[in-house]
């Protein structure tokens, strides 16, 4: 039989989100979602004014061992 559950967080990770590692935590809607539903920002030319997609904060974690990522709203919206 395989071993028990993996640790919920990596040794260097911040406090874990409530998500399992397969999901990411979206701070805009305050719940876990499939990570593919989060969009990471792409480099934009200087002076571009269109709003960027939401981004995510990546905890420092071992691959497969940490909590889900936390998606953050844009700095301008904080």
């Amino acid at each position: 039989m395989r071993r028990g559950p993996r640790s919920l967080r990596g040794r260097d990770a911040p406090a874990p989100t409530p998500c399992v590692p397969a999901e990411c935590f979206d701070l805009l809607v305050r719940h876990c979602v499939a990570c593919g539903l989060l969009r990471t920002p792409r480099p934009k030319p200087a002076g571009a004014s269109s709003p960027a997609p939401r981004t995510a904060l990546q905890p420092q974690e071992s691959v497969g061992a940490g909590a889900g990522e936390a998606a953050l709203p844009l700095p301008g919206l904080l």
């Epitope: 399992v20 990411c24 499939a34 990570c35 593919g36 539903l37 990522e69």
Partner: antibody, heavy 118, light 113 residues
């Protein structure tokens, strides 16, 4: 020892209902999401949906093929969860597996067979 | 929905041979923030339930023999068995868990000559 045991399968008529159960033991049930996956005879696996853990308010996600007809829930003791299947169709005939979800579908039950036929 | 395509659908190899099977997704499964690919491989032996072999495309589940190796990124993934044993007779499925609904490939059936 991690154990997932499904029950409740059987023969049901088209349009009928059935409730499947999955009893979990041997791990911290509240850390996991719990999924249902089915497999028609001789065919591939199909993910049906999952229910998140207590920290996430037991929210659910479903595949389009069963949304509105199937409901996933957990009991208050958090060690059993359910798949309530309504408006069953012949194409719902399959072996139904429960599986725990963390980094992927980590642990699987042995499955329970559902046949929808008149 | 993300479509997962596996090839070949079946293959027969002799004990001790190396085998590779492919899984392709209709869109990238790589989340750029953490460089993880949301892809898993499962083994289903005849008459049994599936068993997790690989997650994050390349991380071997505890207890899985090291002859099983997952590789690839983005849309193209491979499961390699370095030296097949008779007990590896099974159907192997890939699955994405990047976007709902999670979807499985059609499977690759490994037969032993």
């Amino acid at each position: 020892e991690v154990k997932l045991v499904e029950s409740g399968g059987g023969l049901v008529q088209p349009g009928g209902s059935l409730s499947l159960s999955c009893a979990a033991s041997g791990f911290t049930f509240t850390d996991y999401y719990m999924s249902w996956v089915r497999q028609p005879p001789g065919k591939a696996l199909e993910w049906l949906g999952f229910i998140r853990n207590k920290a996430n308010g037991y929210t659910t996600e479903y595949s389009a093929s069963v949304k509105g007809r199937f409901t996933i829930s957990r009991d208050k003791s958090q060690s059993i969860f359910y798949l309530q299947m309504n408006a069953l169709r012949p194409e719902d005939s399959a072996t139904y597996y429960c599986a725990s979800l963390r980094s992927a579908l980590d642990y699987w039950g042995q499955g329970t067979s559902v046949t929808v036929s008149s | 929905d993300i479509v997962m395509s596996q090839s070949p659908s079946s293959l027969a190899v002799s004990v001790g041979e190396k085998v590779t099977m492919s899984c392709k997704s209709s869109q990238s499964l790589l989340y750029s923030n953490n460089q993880k690919n949301y892809l898993a491989w499962y083994q289903q032996k005849p008459g049994q339930s599936p068993k997790l072999l690989i997650y994050w495309a390349s991380t071997r589940e505890s207890g899985v023999p090291d002859r099983f190796t997952g590789s690839g990124s983005g849309t193209d993934f491979t499961l390699t068995i370095s030296s097949v044993k008779a007990e590896d007779l099974a159907v192997y499925y890939c699955q994405q868990y990047y976007i709902y609904p999670y979807t499985f490939g059609g499977g690759t059936k490994l037969e032993i000559k």
